[in-house]
């Protein structure tokens, strides 16, 4: 189920790379966030809580990522034109239940000024 395009700035460019921001409600305690490029899973991050409220962060498809209390940022480096595509944040909520999946995304446009190694 595609819930629509992100209603926030999803792509932040810096130093020839891009930070892709995937937001979730700050009351979500346990979840899996996947970054999809088209239909392909590029990255994922799973946050779970164990006994004693110990937090576990796991990734099956690892990218450089950063977790905050209401977002996961995935970082892509060495941008080139092949990175231009639709990117989706696929959020699976485990806690609080009932289980829910939501998909938001947008198109990543690549301009010459954002490439990592421009020809002078």
């Amino acid at each position: 189920e595609i819930n629509g395009s992100a209603n926030y700035e999803m792509f932040i460019f810096h130093n020839g790379g891009v930070q892709i921001l995937c937001k979730y409600p700050d009351i979500v305690q346990q979840f899996k966030m996947q970054l999809l490029k088209g239909g392909q899973i590029l990255c994922d991050l799973t946050k779970t809580k164990g006994s004693g409220n110990t937090v576990s962060i796991k990734s099956l498809k690892f990218c450089h990522s950063q977790l905050s209390n209401n977002s996961v940022s995935f970082f892509l480096y060495n941008l080139d034109h092949s990175h231009a595509n639709y990117y989706f944040c696929n959020l699976s909520i485990f806690d609080p239940p009932p289980f829910k999946v939501t998909l938001t995304g947008g198109y990543l446009h690549i301009y010459e000024s954002q490439l990592c190694c421009q020809l002078k």
Epitope: E1, N3, G4, N7, K23, Y24, P25, D26, I27, V28, N70, D95, P96, P97, P98, F99, K100, T102, T104
Partner: antibody, heavy 117, light 107 residues
Framework: QITLKESGPTLVKPTQTLTLTCTFS??????????VGWIRQPPGKALEWLAF???????RYSPSLKSRLTITKDTSKNQVVLTMTNMDPVDTATYYC?????????WGQGTLVTVSS | DIQMTQSPSSLSASVGDRVTITCRAS??????LAWYQQKPEKAPKSLIY???SLQSGVPSRFSGSGSGTDFTLTISSLQPEDFATYYC?????????FGGGTKVEIK
């Protein structure tokens, strides 16, 4: 501080459509609030869940009432609206809206709706 | 749908008594159960979530236990303000369902 308040008609006639509005404060349905639900309680009876709307506009309904219910939200106004068609005297109840983070942690005061001709 | 069955439907107790209310789910719901207190003409108030976690501001005489299908709400020493109706609710899956309620009355 999270607060919710229901508003709407206190009396509706059979076959009419009921429209209830939940106006809330203390959270945003944009990102930080998981969602808002509606629950009703006929006089002297138990609580019954009706509908729920998530921050991303995903909607869930009680299967037994799904054909009669519509839930919508207006994030900019901090409001959630429930409409219920083809009202019947058995729908006489106090209708509550509530903020949900799994369980319903904050409730409105409720509004009594009587269905009578 | 998951049916929630509360027992007893009503009970009489005195101030200082230990009171236990049970709630049974028709299928396993892990620990995704909440308890609410409702006084006449008032909205329900959240007491317990995740079967045993005390909602902020709720007195410690209230406690919850259980997982799977069988759950218990205990009031360790009943106070005058605790005379009310108590409801359980599962939030493991849709449709969300409530128990039929337990009315705690003064003996």
């Amino acid at each position: 501080q999270i607060t919710l308040k229901e508003s709407g008609p206190t009396l509706v006639k059979p076959t009419q459509t009921l429209t209830l509005t939940c106006t809330f404060s203390g959270f945003s349905l944009g990102t930080s609030g998981l969602g808002v639900g509606w629950i009703r309680q006929p006089p002297g009876k138990a609580l019954e869940w009706l509908a729920f709307i998530y921050w991303d506009d995903d909607k869930r309904y009680s299967p037994s009432l799904k054909s009669r219910l519509t839930i919508t939200k207006d994030t900019s106004k901090n409001q959630v609206v429930l409409t219920m068609t083809n009202m019947d005297p058995v729908d006489t109840a106090t209708y509550y809206c509530a903020h949900r983070r799994g369980f319903f942690d904050y409730w409105g005061q409720g509004t009594l709706v009587t269905v009578s001709s | 749908d998951i049916q929630m069955t509360q027992s007893p439907s009503s009970l009489s107790a005195s101030v200082g008594d230990r009171v236990t209310i049970t709630c049974r789910a028709s299928q396993g719901i892990s620990s995704w159960l909440a308890w609410y207190q409702q006084k006449p003409e008032k909205a329900p108030k959240s007491l317990i979530y995740a079967a045993s976690s005390l909602q902020s501001g709720v007195p410690s005489r209230f406690s919850g236990s259980g997982s799977g299908t069988d759950f218990t709400l205990t009031i360790s020493s009943l106070q005058p303000e605790d005379f009310a109706t108590y409801y359980c609710q599962q939030y493991n899956s849709y449709p969300l369902t409530f128990g039929g309620g337990t009315k705690v009355e003064i003996k």
